[in-house]
């Protein structure tokens, strides 16, 4: 997150981290039920660990943290390269969470966001627009949903109904490492960090997010059948 601020501790209890190796964070994720996470399809890796209830970027133990393995990763069957449509993936964890003030699921919005809606995006991604400079703690940033027209004008030929743009205040954006993390509007999960241009946070180059209102049925059906 570029030019965000430290999230309040436990204010984003649905925020998850996907880790490679001992502790290398590579993507964000969102807790949507006691045993299921959502993340971006482009975050798919064969082996990873899941950390919930953690505020710090560092591996230091925190009392609210819970660690999990992913036992099933289900990318949306329509995820495509190089267009990046349908950029979402469900992850089933090896057990259910212990519900606490640090770890709670978020409800997915059934209605699509409208232009001007204020939302919160969060993550541990780089805080510098063009270099890796990771934060000490989870970062939060208020962003505004942009019109479909403005979104398509920013990225001609690259936007479809499975995406929406938000942000566009120069110097503020999601960035590398935030992928798969939550965009929450009015208390409901509206999107996932999907993609944007380098360097991050350029004028007229807003963040592009997976438009989750288009996938409520697929998410429910997939969870029910797995």
């Amino acid at each position: 997150i570029v030019n965000g601020s430290d999230c309040q501790k436990d204010a984003q209890p649905w925020q998850g981290a996907l880790l490679l190796g001992p502790n290398k964070l590579y993507c964000g994720a969102v807790l949507i039920s006691p045993q299921w996470l959502l993340t971006a399809a482009h975050c798919r890796k064969p082996v990873f660990r899941i950390r919930l209830g953690h505020h710090s970027m560092s591996p230091v133990y925190e009392s609210g943290q819970q660690m999990f393995q992913g036992i099933k990763s289900i990318p949306h069957p329509g995820y495509s390269h190089p267009g990046h449509s349908n950029d979402l993936m469900l992850i089933k964890m090896n057990r259910k969470i212990r519900d606490s003030h640090s770890v709670k699921p978020v409800e997915i919005a059934c209605d699509c966001a409208t232009e001007g809606t204020r939302c919160m995006v969060s993550g541990w991604g780089t805080t510098s627009s063009s270099h890796n400079n990771f934060p000490k703690v989870l970062q939060c940033l208020n962003i505004t949903v942009l019109s479909e027209e403005r979104c398509k004008n920013s990225y001609p030929g690259q936007i479809d109904k499975t995406m929406f743009c938000a942000g566009d205040e120069e110097g503020r954006d999601s960035c590398q490492g935030d992928s798969g993390g939550p965009v929450v509007c009015n208390g409901k999960l509206q999107g996932l960090v999907s993609w944007g241009d380098f360097p991050c946070a350029q004028r007229n180059r807003p963040g592009v997010y997976t438009n989750l209102c288009e996938f409520v049925k697929w998410i429910k059906d997939t969870m029910n059948s797995n």
Epitope: K24, A40, H42, H81, P82, H84, G157, D178, F198
Partner: antibody, heavy 127, light 108 residues
Framework: QLQLQESGPGLVKPSETLSLTCTVS??????????WVWIRQPPGKGLEWIGS???????YYSPSLKSRVTISVDTSKNQFSLKLSSVTAADTAVYYC???????????????????WGQGTTVTVSS | DIQMTQSPSSLSASVGDRVTITCRAS??????LNWYQQKPGKAPKLLIY???SLQSGVPSRFSGSGSGTDFTLTISSLQPEDFATYYC??????????FGGGTKVEIK
Amino acid sequence: QLQLQESGPGLVKPSETLSLTCTVSGGSISSDDYYWVWIRQPPGKGLEWIGSIDYYASTYYSPSLKSRVTISVDTSKNQFSLKLSSVTAADTAVYYCARGRPLGYGAKHYYYGMDVWGQGTTVTVSS
Amino acid sequence: DIQMTQSPSSLSASVGDRVTITCRASQSISSYLNWYQQKPGKAPKLLIYSASSLQSGVPSRFSGSGSGTDFTLTISSLQPEDFATYYCQQSPYFPPLTFGGGTKVEIK
């Protein structure tokens, strides 16, 4: 300013293993989310991608060379390396190392252009 | 694998000419196309990335356009230092990363 320098033997015998190292100066190989790439160019021909390694040490190889190629990173020496086994005369080429700069973040991060190159080193395979 | 076809393979032009080189991908690559210039005995140099973005330090007479499968590199007014070989390159999510066969721009 970032600079790349290839090093290794200029002559390799057929069936042996070609080993090259790329030393990165003017910046840390592990500090930023770049790709580190090997490319070759046979005499009088075009450019051929050999493979890449990313920030997470995930490797990506050309399918035609995959069975013979290993790319690795040594962050303590600020170097990345290429090993190509069972070489033949067809592997004679100028070998370049390069930095791959991602074209975007998130899903766009897997796409990159090579913005910094070494000057290249000529490798001849001959007995 | 995605094939990249460049045309022409060579061309002769004079200083001041407008030069156009085309690159065609065998399937859509969105805007994930880069252009390089290579002079004899030298490493390639990145000119254009993401189909149309000018790499820092590259003169504005170079421009790129296109998306999907058809792309163009244009030199608006050829200069003596522009005589070189030009390559297009697509960078895929899945390997292999591939280059076009090259276009040699020679002095007429």
